[in-house]
C-alpha cells in the first residue's frame, strides 16, 4: 500500500525531539502554499491553506515517520499553530510507483484576510536537541477584499467589496468640481477627496436614504487646477469604519450642458483596512 498522511494538531515539541537520533531523514524538497475555498454552514465560505510538500527521493525517507507544519500569522494580532502529519506506511520506494516524487498535502489552516503567514515544515525524526535540523519555510500573504476570491466573503461584502460607486467627476469651473456616485445601503456617510499631487478639495457627503441605492451629487470647492485630478471616495461603513475600500475616478471637463461625463477608468483601492 502507498503511504498517505494523517494529520492532527501538535502544539508542543514532538516527542521525538527529546530522543537522541543517530540518523535522520533528509529535508523536504519543496514546500508550497495556496489558498482554497470551502463552504461553511452559514452560506459564507472560509479560506484555508493548502500546504503541499515534496519529499526528497533518496533512501533516507525510510526513516521518515511524520512531517510537522507550523504556521505563524502576523496581522493585527499574532497566531501560531502546528499540525503533525504521520505517514501511514513505511516508504518502500524513493519515488511514487507511477513516477514522480512523493507529494503530500494538508488543507486546514484557516486564512484571515490580508495577513502575512510564515509556514515552516520539518521531517520527523528531526535533529537532536541543540542541533540544527533540515527544515523548509515559505511566506504566504493572504489577499484582501479586492481579491477575486475574497471579495465574496460576507466580511468583505459588508466592507463594500461588491459596491461599484460608478464615480463620475467633472470640472465645472476653476473653483468647483462636481462629483456623482452611486450610494450603497451599507452606509450613509462618505468622504470625497480631490488630489492633484496634493489635496485640492474635499467634502463630507451624508446620504440619509441609506436603505436604497441612489445617485448622490456633490459640488466641491477646489484650490488648484482640477482637470486630470484624482477623486477618491472613502465610505464609512459600520464594519470597517474609516478604513473601508476606497474608490477612485478622474476629473474631466464638464460638457457644456453641465452634465458630468461618465468615466471608464474607475479604480478601487483598499484603504488602511485590508480585511
Amino acid at each position: 500500500r502507498e503511504p498517505t498522511v494523517q494529520c492532527g494538531s501538535e502544539t508542543g515539541p514532538s516527542p521525538e525531539w527529546m530522543l537522541q537520533h543517530d540518523l535522520i531523514p533528509g529535508d523536504l524538497r519543496d514546500l508550497r502554499v495556496e489558498p482554497v475555498t470551502t463552504s461553511v454552514a452559514t452560506g459564507d465560505y472560509s479560506i484555508l491553506m493548502n500546504v503541499s510538500w515534496v519529499l526528497r527521493a533518496d533512501a533516507s525517507i525510510r526513516l521518515l515517520k511524520a512531517t510537522k507544519i507550523c504556521v505563524t500569522g502576523k496581522s493585527n494580532f499574532q497566531s501560531y499553530s502546528c499540525v503533525r502529519c504521520n505517514y501511514t506506511e513505511a516508504f518502500q520506494t524513493q519515488t511514487r510507483p507511477s513516477g514522480g516524487k512523493w507529494t503530500f498535502s494538508y488543507i486546514g489552516f484557516p486564512v484571515e484576510l490580508n495577513t502575512v503567514y510564515f509556514i515552516g515544515a520539518h521531517n520527523i525524526p528531526n535533529a537532536n536537541m541543540n542541533e540544527d535540523g533540515p527544515s523548509m519555510s515559505v511566506n504566504f500573504t493572504s489577499p484582501g477584499c479586492l481579491d477575486h476570491i475574497m471579495k465574496y466573503k460576507k466580511k468583505c461584502v459588508k466592507a463594500g467589496s461588491l459596491w461599484d460607486p460608478n464615480i463620475t467627476a467633472c470640472k465645472k469651473n476653476e473653483e468647483t468640481v462636481e462629483v456623482n456616485f452611486t450610494t450603497t445601503p451599507l452606509g450613509n456617510r462618505y468622504m470625497a477627496l480631490i488630489q492633484h499631487s496634493t489635496i485640492i478639495g474635499f467634502s463630507q457627503v451624508f446620504e440619509p436614504h441609506q436603505k436604497k441605492q441612489t445617485r448622490a451629487s456633490v459640488v466641491i470647492p477646489v484650490t488648484g487646477d482640477s482637470e486630470g485630478a484624482t477623486v477618491q471616495l472613502t465610505p464609512y461603513f459600520p464594519t470597517c469604519g474609516s478604513d473601508c475600500i476606497r474608490h477612485k475616478g478622474t476629473v474631466v471637463l464638464c460638457p457644456q450642458t453641465g452634465v458630468p461625463f461618465p468615466l471608464d477608468n474607475n479604480k478601487s483601492k483598499p484603504g488602511g483596512w485590508l480585511p
Epitope: A59, T93, G99, K101
Partner: antibody, heavy 118, light 107 residues
Amino acid sequence: QVQLQQPGAELVRPGASVKLSCKTSGYTFISYWMNWVKQGGPEQGLEWIGRIDPYDSEIQYNQKFKDKAILTVDKSSSAAYMQLISLTSEDSAVYYCARSGGFDWFAYWGQGTLVTVS
Amino acid sequence: DIQMTQSPASLSVSVGETVTITCRASENINSNLAWYQQKKGKSPQLLVYDVTNLADGVPSRFSGSGSGTQYSLKINSLQSEDFGSYYCQHFWRPPYTFGGGTNLEIK
C-alpha cells in the same frame, strides 16, 4: 524484460564533447531514476557520476563531475543521455547507465560505452 | 561524502571454498548497501540489495549481512562462475560511492 542499450565505443578528440545515449525498454521510463557510472579501466573501480529523474528531469551530480557531465532525458523515446564536455585523456573510460531499483541500488545496467580520448 | 572501504583487494581461492568480503562505511548508512559482481569485459550485475536481499536469479550460496558501518558478503561453496570482481555500494544519500573492489581469482 528490462533493457538498457548503449553504443559500444566512441572515439573523440581532446577538448571536444561527446553525447552518450542509453535507450531503455521493458519498463515505465518515468518511474525510476537513471544513474551514470564511470569505470576508468578494466581493473579500476566504479565512480557514480550522477542521476536524473525522468519524471521531472531533476538531476543530482557527484560534485567531482558537475562541470564534466550534463544529464538529460527524452521521455518520448524513453532514452537517457550524458554529454561529456572538454574531454581529456583522464576521461577515457567505460561509461555505464544504470537504472535504480526501489531505492538507488542499480538493478539494471547498460553494456557500457568505451570513450577513448585521443 | 561517505567513503566505502572494501577488503581484501584481491583473493585467490579454490572452487568449493567459502569466502567473505567486507565493506566498511565511513559513517552509518542505515543498511542501505548493495553488492555487485562484474566479470571481465562485462557490466556489473546486482547481487544483493538492502544488505541481505538477493537480486533475481542470484544463487542462494550468496548471502549478505551487517548493519551500521560494517557489512559483508559471503559466498559458500564457490563455483567457477563466481570468479570476477565484487563491489559494494551505499545508497543512503547522494553522492553514492562504491568500494574499491575485490578481485576473486581461481587458485
